[in-house]
């Protein structure tokens, strides 16, 4: 093992001082799996990235520690880092657009991604395409792709163009799109999740 620990440390060392502070505060309130305790606040707040990694691994073991770290990073809006942390711990495969490492393709993620399940509905019902493009720009979409989607005349044709790039995306890339949809049209996502 050891890979998960290294990946946690790498993620934490790639947080700025402000982000590390925010990470610790979120760790104090993040929901935990049954049977796991919380790292004491006093000890937690004074730790550097290395100490915190050791503490996370000793409290939660490597696998759950990595998962918990990824959850907190995601909660901080750092989807890309969370995805890369999971990539490093699971060693997945598949194409990785515009600077995102490939996460596990199927581990604990059976079936189609939400984005693929609801492709037709999203093409028909997404209205705030510009928001999605800005959220994905430089992370999942290259400059060329971004411009190609923007050039389309209507929202459905923009979405259709956006979906033309998704076959090359991995799970993390699709998560970024889903996250952007939650931020821009949460009611639509909720509606589709219920359907």
């Amino acid at each position: 093992m050891g890979r998960a620990r290294d990946a946690i440390l790498d993620a934490l060392e790639n947080l700025t001082a402000e982000e590390l502070k925010k990470f610790k505060l979120k760790l104090l309130s993040v929901p935990l799996r049954e049977g796991y305790g919380r790292i004491p606040r006093g000890a937690l707040l004074s730790m550097d990235a290395l100490d915190l990694t050791d503490k996370l691994v000793s409290f939660y073991l490597e696998t759950y520690g990595a998962e918990l770290t990824a959850n907190v990073l995601r909660d901080m809006g750092l989807q890309e880092m969370a995805g890369q942390l999971q990539a490093a711990t699971h060693q997945g495969s598949g194409a990785a657009p515009a600077g995102i490492q490939a996460p596990p393709q199927s581990a604990a993620k059976p079936g189609l991604h939400f984005i693929d399940q609801h492709r037709a509905a999203l093409i028909a019902r997404v209205t705030n395409v510009e928001w999605l493009l800005d959220a994905l720009y430089g992370k999942v979409l290259t400059d060329e792709q971004y411009q190609a989607v923007r050039a389309e005349p209507t929202n459905p044709s923009k979405m259709r163009k956006l979906f033309s790039f998704t076959p090359a995306w991995n799970w993390t890339c699709k998560d970024l799109l889903l996250q952007a949809l939650r931020e821009s049209q949460s009611y639509l996502v909720e509606d589709l999740e219920r359907s």
């Epitope: 890979r3 790639n14 700025t16 490093a88 194409a95 990785a96 600077g99 490492q101 490939a102 290259t142």
Partner: antibody, heavy 118, light 107 residues
Framework: EVQLQQSGAELVRPGSSVKMSCETS????????LTWVKQRPGQGLEWIGY????????EYNEKFKDKATLTSDTSSSIVYMQLSSLTSEDSAIYFC???????????WGQGTTLTVSS | AIQMTQTTSSLSASLGDRVTISCRAS??????LHWYQQKPDGTVKLLIF???GLRSGVPSRFSGSGSGTDYSLTISNLEQEDIATYFC?????????FGGGTKLEIK
């Protein structure tokens, strides 16, 4: 300790190709991207492209799309860059660097000097 | 492509000085800005990542700040070993681009 060791200097003829290497150690090779950067004498840095060695995915700077080809050998933890149809404009120092989680280049090789001359 | 501009190509300062090197992007780069040091022997090293994150092992006299399009690297107490060329780089959008560099010399 993370280390990136690049191959030695090359002197080649115009029109030919060259393949330089970047040998990595001290980390899990397949969980990171490796990127390449060009520096002409006395000039700035230009990003060429990157490869994710875990799956072979590549992205190139449009400017280098027909010039550079990035490949990797996971069994030996080495990344290669092949440059084709060489001209004097390709004479430069080429650096490999590991791609960090913020898309920064967190460890750098020492550079490979390429001289294209007849 | 996003243009990165370091308006000062060379800078002279005295040991112990506080030195600030600036970098401007042609559009908002949302803090995806990193600083590198290239020593006279050619070796390159990451100093600051994501605007303000100090790379482990880099002396605390180095700091980074900025937002939007304007960013800066500050060396609070210049030492002889800081003589080098400093480059900024954006990674918000492909192709990733560097500033032209600022060469720091001792007065």
């Amino acid at each position: 300790e993370v280390q990136l060791q690049q191959s030695g200097a090359e002197l080649v003829r115009p029109g030919s190709s060259v393949k330089m290497s970047c040998e990595t150690s001290g980390y899990t090779f397949t969980t990171y991207g490796l990127t390449w950067v060009k520096q002409r004498p006395g000039q700035g840095l230009e990003w060429i492209g990157y490869i994710y060695v875990g799956n072979g995915y590549t992205e190139y700077n449009e400017k280098f799309k027909d010039k550079a080809t990035l490949t990797s050998d996971t069994s030996s933890s080495i990344v290669y860059m092949q440059l084709s149809s060489l001209t004097s404009e390709d004479s430069a120092i080429y650096f490999c660097a590991r791609l960090g989680l913020r898309r920064h280049f967190d460890y750098w090789g020492q550079g490979t000097t390429l001289t294209v001359s007849s | 492509a996003i243009q990165m501009t370091q308006t000062t190509s060379s800078l002279s300062a005295s040991l112990g000085d506080r030195v600030t090197i600036s970098c401007r992007a042609s559009q908002d780069i949302s803090n995806y800005l990193h600083w590198y040091q290239q020593k006279p022997d050619g070796t390159v090293k990451l100093l600051i990542f994501f605007t303000s994150g100090l790379r482990s092992g880099v002396p605390s006299r180095f700091s980074g700040s900025g937002s939007g399009t304007d960013y800066s690297l500050t060396i609070s107490n210049l030492e002889q070993e800081d003589i080098a060329t400093y480059f900024c780089q954006q990674s918000i959008l492909l192709p990733w681009t560097f500033g032209g560099g600022t060469k720091l010399e001792i007065k």
